[in-house]
Interface confidence: low
């Protein structure tokens, strides 16, 4: 029988107490083969991360700076569930660290150096770790001890609780420092106060704290926020400027052999006996000898951390950079404006390959980081771990969804400013062999279906999107009675036909045969009956333009497009006969990096873009033979996106509307772990 | 944190040859790429040669074809081989290594040892 006990860590003789009483609460309303809770005192919070780990308990609620010592080695636990606030139908898991200022003042975050700063008191995380986590680096050296090289950074501060003896500095705009509300700067509302009476230029607070303060739109739009991409915009744009999202209260656990699912089971059962107006004799969130014992008091329930997220996701890029900056102290000798090189994201081996050679070409410009699937990829930049990489307009969506941003398009025509001119896009078709006459878009259900893989433009999104919308659900291995979508589940009908060996079977990189469009165009020639890729697929795979053996004696002629209208047309006929138009492919990246992602892909292109003649004998950028190995090997060039620089604007609202409709059938773990983080 | 530890410094003739070696401890999963570096008084620390662990390696064109840098990952050791030594080979070597873990926005952290003396007589 599995121990369904969840033993939960306390801190305090008061916690314990309390935990004493969920427990014999939770029996009372739970079957004896539901969850149980069991009670494990320490002396700590750290004490309770490390008994964890060790498997002496399973579960504490943790404040997100020590969620961040929870994931460091050798502890490693994930959150698993999220306290919220606000209301079920509004669940608030997370608060924005901004910083504020007037609308009138003139100077971006990289100005900061000399102007007058509100804090909402010492070692808080809105009003200073974080900020100041993120100054880090810029801060004079010796950087040690911290409140000196502030008080030198800026002309002046209010940062309650700091010492005014030895850093007078720190409390030159509230005399004292006073580290309560005696002191009027203190706080969050504090903070803002002292921005408002002119005694800051810049307060540090959370996105909240000026809605609270100033009820009156008139009055908030004097003030505008920071963004750390050096520009400034309006108050109530914070999820698009903040210095970092923290989460409020989460609860961690081993990441191996954790319990999660157990973990939630319990809480989703004790929030329906004992949440919020539930019970009178025992509350869950509610503190009768002291605050916050267990959970916040101001907690209304709580939400499951989707699995596919880990600490760094959990706790994002920005704020796990400016707690590493404080906690660890170390900065780049000599930090330059030269970009460092940019690492690009390979998937599986093949790509490997081939981003090994161009690192060596590119001379340090260019480093290779590996990953299994594009979603792994796309996680690895979000927290850092990589730079770059290109995408199909599917991925570009999730990757915006994750907080990434396109940074330029490949485009397939040649034509004289390339570069200059981003293009419309390309055709997603359905191909069939045009011996199976009698097949129509009308009749493809019991068929056999060939796919780039799940979640990409012209394989997925845009035939299944259409289907979606005929059959209404989304069973689409139901639908077709076998195929091949790399990406999909293992036992799925969908996995059926395709030819990976092993583990490699069905998988979203090259090791699966059939994966991508020249795989799905294979999949067609040897086994399927309707294959879904771009427009230039058949033509680059016939009459020996591929000179694999399956692919060398095929003719062009012997394939044709299902139209949407029920008739057939010929390949070359994609104008007329298509199921829509998607989006190119585009290199993403992480916002910080735009500038020199942009820098360094113009400069690689020059080098070793389209213009090479002879790629027998040199690195071609562009080229694998039709492997589409890093980029689609028809790319002609990587286009500057002017203003389509947000996954939506590139997109376009028609394709993020169809994708948006399709997430009710989404397998994509990572767009569910950055929409909890960003519904 | 990641501590590197040198050895392998002293004094030899021209044209001799030395072998660096720097261990590294602490948080090592965290490094993406190992090297070293180079100051002779007066002069700025310069790169001399750096490996990633994908196996890249990176040279100062002063020492192609003399300097040979490898890894042992295993063993979380980079080496530096110095053949053909010249006299203006002469400085402190530092054993650098960059943290491929989230560090300040757009820069990686680097960890320093605390150098070993090489000197080439004529």
């Known amino acids: 029988v599995p121990d369904k006990t969840v033993r939960w860590c306390a801190v305090s003789e008061h916690e314990a107490t309390k935990c004493q009483s969920f427990r014999d609460h939770m029996k009372s309303v739970i079957p004896s083969d539901g969850p149980s809770v069991a009670c494990v005192k320490k002396a700590s919070y750290l004490d309770c991360i490390r008994a964890i780990a060790a498997n002496e308990a399973d579960a504490v609620t943790l404040d997100a700076g020590l969620v961040y010592d929870a994931y460091l080695a050798p502890n490693n636990l994930k959150p698993v569930v999220a306290e919220f606030y606000g209301s079920k139908e509004d669940p608030q898991t997370f608060y924005y660290a901004v910083a504020v200022v007037k609308k009138d003042s003139g100077f971006q975050m990289n100005q900061l150096r000399g102007k007058k700063s509100c804090h909402t008191g010492l070692g808080r995380s809105a009003g200073w770790n974080i900020p100041i986590g993120l100054l880090y680096c810029d801060l004079p050296e010796p950087r040690k001890p911290l409140e000196k090289a502030v008080a030198n950074f800026f002309s002046g501060s209010c940062a309650p609780c700091a010492d005014g003896t030895d850093f007078p500095q720190l409390c030159q705009l509230c005399p004292g420092c006073g580290c309560s509300t005696l002191n009027q700067y203190f706080g969050y509302s504090g903070a803002f106060k002292c921005l408002k009476d002119g005694a800051g230029d810049v307060a540090f607070v959370k996105h909240s704290t000026i809605f609270e303060n100033l009820a009156n739109k008139a009055d908030r739009d004097q003030y505008e926020l920071l963004c750390l991409d050096n520009t400034r915009k309006p108050v109530d744009e914070y999820k698009d400027c903040h210095l970092a999202q923290v989460p409020s209260h989460t609860v961690v656990a081993r990441s191996m052999g954790g319990k999660e699912d157990l973990i939630w089971e319990l809480l989703n059962q004790a929030q329906e006996h004992f949440g919020k107006d539930k019970s009178k004799e025992f509350q869950l969130f509610s503190s009768p000898h002291g605050k916050d014992l267990l959970f916040k008091d101001s907690a209304h329930g709580f939400l499951k951390v989707p699995p596919r997220m880990d600490a760094k996701m959990y706790l994002g890029y920005e704020y796990v950079t400016a707690i590493r900056n404080l906690r660890e102290g170390t900065c780049p000798e000599a930090p330059t404006d030269e970009c460092k090189p940019v690492k690009w994201c390979a998937l599986s081996h093949h790509e490997r390959l081939k981003c090994d050679e161009w690192s060596v070409n590119s001379v340090g410009k260019i480093e290779c980081v590996s990953a299994e699937t594009t979603e792994d990829c796309i996680a690895k930049i979000m927290n850092g771990e990589a730079d770059a990489m290109s995408l199909d307009g599917g991925f570009v969506y999730i990757a915006g969804k994750c907080g990434l941003v396109p940074v330029l398009a490949e485009n397939y025509n040649k034509s004289d400013n390339c570069e200059d001119t981003p293009e419309a896009g390309y055709f997603a078709i359905a191909v069939v062999k045009k011996s199976a006459s009698d097949l129509t878009w009308d009749n493809l259900k019991g068929k056999k279906s060939c796919h780039t893989a799940v979640g990409r433009t012209a394989g997925w999104n845009i035939p299944m999107g259409l289907l979606y919308n005929k059959i209404n659900h989304c069973r689409f291995d139901e639908f077709f009675s076998e195929g091949c979508a790399p990406g999909s589940k293992k036992d799925s009908s969908l996995c059926k036909l395709c030819m990976g060996s092993g583990l490699n079977l069905c998988e979203p990189n090259n090791k699966e045969g059939y994966y991508g469009y020249t795989g799905a165009f294979r999949c067609l020639v040897e086994k399927g009956d309707v294959a879904f890729v771009k427009h230039q697929t058949v033509p680059q795979n016939t009459g020996g333009k591929n000179p694999d053996p399956w692919a060398k004696n095929l003719n062009e002629k012997d394939y044709e497009l299902l139209c949407l209208d029920g008739t057939r047309k010929p390949v070359e006929e994609y104008a007329n006969c298509h199921l829509a138009r998607a989006p190119n492919h585009a290199v993403v990246t992480r916002k910080d990096k735009e500038a020199c992602v942009h820098k360094i892909l113009r400069q690689q292109q020059h080098l070793f873009g389209s213009n090479v003649t002879d790629c027998s004998g040199n690195f071609c950028l562009f080229r694998s033979e039709t492997k589409d190995l890093l980029f689609r090997d028809d790319t002609v060039c990587l286009a500057k996106l002017h203003d389509r620089n947000t996954y939506e604007k590139y997109l376009g609202e028609e394709y993020v509307k169809a994708v948006g409709n399709l997430r009710k059938c989404s397998t994509s773990s990572l767009l569910e772990a950055c929409t909890f983080r960003r519904p | 944190q990641v501590q590197l530890v040198e050895s392998g410094g002293g004094v030899v003739q021209a044209g001799g040859s030395l072998r660096l070696s720097c261990v590294a401890s602490?948080?090592?999963?965290?490094?993406?790429?190992m090297g070293w570096y180079r100051q002779a008084p007066g002069n700025q620390r310069e790169l001399v040669a750096a490996?990633?662990?994908?196996?890249?390696?990176n040279y100062a064109d002063s020492v192609k074809g003399r300097f040979t840098i490898s890894r042992d990952n295993a063993e979380n050791t980079v080496y530096l081989q110095m053949n053909s030594l010249k006299p203006e080979d002469t400085a402190v070597y530092y054993c650098?290594?960059?943290?491929?873990?989230?560090?300040?926005?757009?820069?990686?952290?680097?960890?320093w040892g605390q150098g070993t003396q090489v000197t080439v007589s004529s």
């Open positions: 602490g948080s090592v999963f965290s490094i993406d790429a």
């Open positions: 650098n290594a960059r943290s491929k873990l989230i560090a300040r926005i757009n820069n990686p952290y680097e960890y």
């Open positions: 490996m990633t662990n994908a196996g890249s390696t």
